[in-house]
């Protein structure tokens, strides 16, 4: 789960160790703040849940690319 370190900073301290099916994902946020222990991705699921994931994992990178393509194609 994302943990709020301060009002402005969200960090991931633990990442999910299983793949989330792409059809369950709605969006993502990159976590790059140097005050966080590591760079991470927060996926938001279609049920509104937020899950931290490791951007070094292939399924995470593939899911991000898929969401980027879907998001752009949805734009008018």
């Amino acid at each position: 789960q994302p943990d709020s370190v301060s009002i402005a900073i969200t960090c991931c301290f633990n990442v999910i160790n299983r793949k989330i099916p792409i059809q369950r994902l709605e969006s993502y946020t990159r976590i790059t703040n140097i005050q966080c222990p590591k760079e991470a991705v927060i996926f938001k699921t279609k049920r509104g849940k937020e899950v931290c994931a490791d951007p070094k994992e292939r399924w995470v990178r593939d899911s991000m690319k898929h969401l980027d393509q879907i998001f752009q194609n949805l734009k008018p």
């Epitope: 140097i34 222990p37 590591k38 951007p55 070094k56 690319k65 998001f71």
Partner: antibody
Framework: QVQLVQSGAEVKKPGSSVKVSCKAS????????MHWVRQAPGQGLEWMGR????????KFDPKFQGRVTITADTSTSTAYMELSSLRSEDTAVYYC??????????WGQGTTVTVSS | DIQMTQSPSSLSASVGDRVTITCKAF??????RAWYQQKPGKAPKLLIH???SLEHGVPSRFSGSGSGTDYTLTISSLQPEDFATYYC?????????FGGGTKVEIK
């Protein structure tokens, strides 16, 4: 705070090799990717390649494949870039930078490499 | 490789001006672009990455827009410290590539 401190300027002969180091403080390099980007005098930026220090997996611009070696030592939080078969066109400032997503939010100060006979 | 074409290569502007720099990718990069500022003798500094992510500490006068292959960096009101060279970069696919740069000079 994060600091990437690079080794000093080098003057090299054509055909030789150069090895530049990049020591990180304020971050764990095994949690990120370490990239190398160069900039020839008065020119733009050119990505050379990167390493995942966690498993030593590397990726390079094909232009440099076979001529560049990127390594990392997690025990000293240091990344290295070695470029071989140097030619005058390799005269440039070489930067290390961090970023797992493919963009670079922290950079070293740069190392000037001059290739001259 | 995905080629990035930046324009103009240089421009002259005054303090307070609105400045726009454009970057065109030779294929769709799905908003995966970054903008950097570089001053002489210094390393580049990340300004913006992705669709709208302004890097921590970067003034709000900097903004990015665009989609597909066409992207823009806008400085809403140029300040004296903004005179520098700006680069776009795509991070959709490796090898990551940069635009040729735009030098913003004092008019």
């Amino acid at each position: 705070q994060v600091q990437l401190v690079q080794s000093g300027a080098e003057v090299k002969k054509p055909g030789s090799s150069v090895k530049v180091s990049c020591k990180a403080s304020g971050l764990t390099i095994s949690h990120t990717y370490m990239h190398w980007v160069r900039q020839a005098p008065g020119q733009g930026l050119e990505w050379m390649g990167r390493i995942d220090p966690d498993n030593h997996n590397t990726k390079f611009d094909p232009k440099f494949q076979g001529r560049v070696t990127i390594t990392a030592d997690t025990s000293t939080s240091t990344a290295y870039m070695e470029l071989s078969s140097l030619r005058s066109e390799d005269t440039a400032v070489y930067y290390c930078a961090r970023g797992v997503f493919g963009f670079f939010d922290h950079w070293g100060q740069g190392t000037t490499v001059t290739v001259s006979s | 490789d995905i080629q990035m074409t930046q324009s103009p290569s240089s421009l002259s502007a005054s303090v307070g001006d609105r400045v726009t720099i454009t970057c065109k990718a030779f294929e769709d990069i799905y908003n995966r672009r970054a903008w950097y500022q570089q001053k002489p003798g210094k390393a580049p500094k990340l300004l913006i990455h992705g669709a709208t992510s302004l890097e921590h500490g970067v003034p709000s006068r900097f903004s990015g827009s665009g989609s597909g292959t066409d992207y823009t960096l806008t400085i809403s009101s140029l300040q004296p410290e903004d005179f520098a060279t700006y680069y776009c970069q795509q991070f959709w696919s490796a090898p990551y590539t940069f635009g040729g740069g735009t030098k913003v000079e004092i008019k």
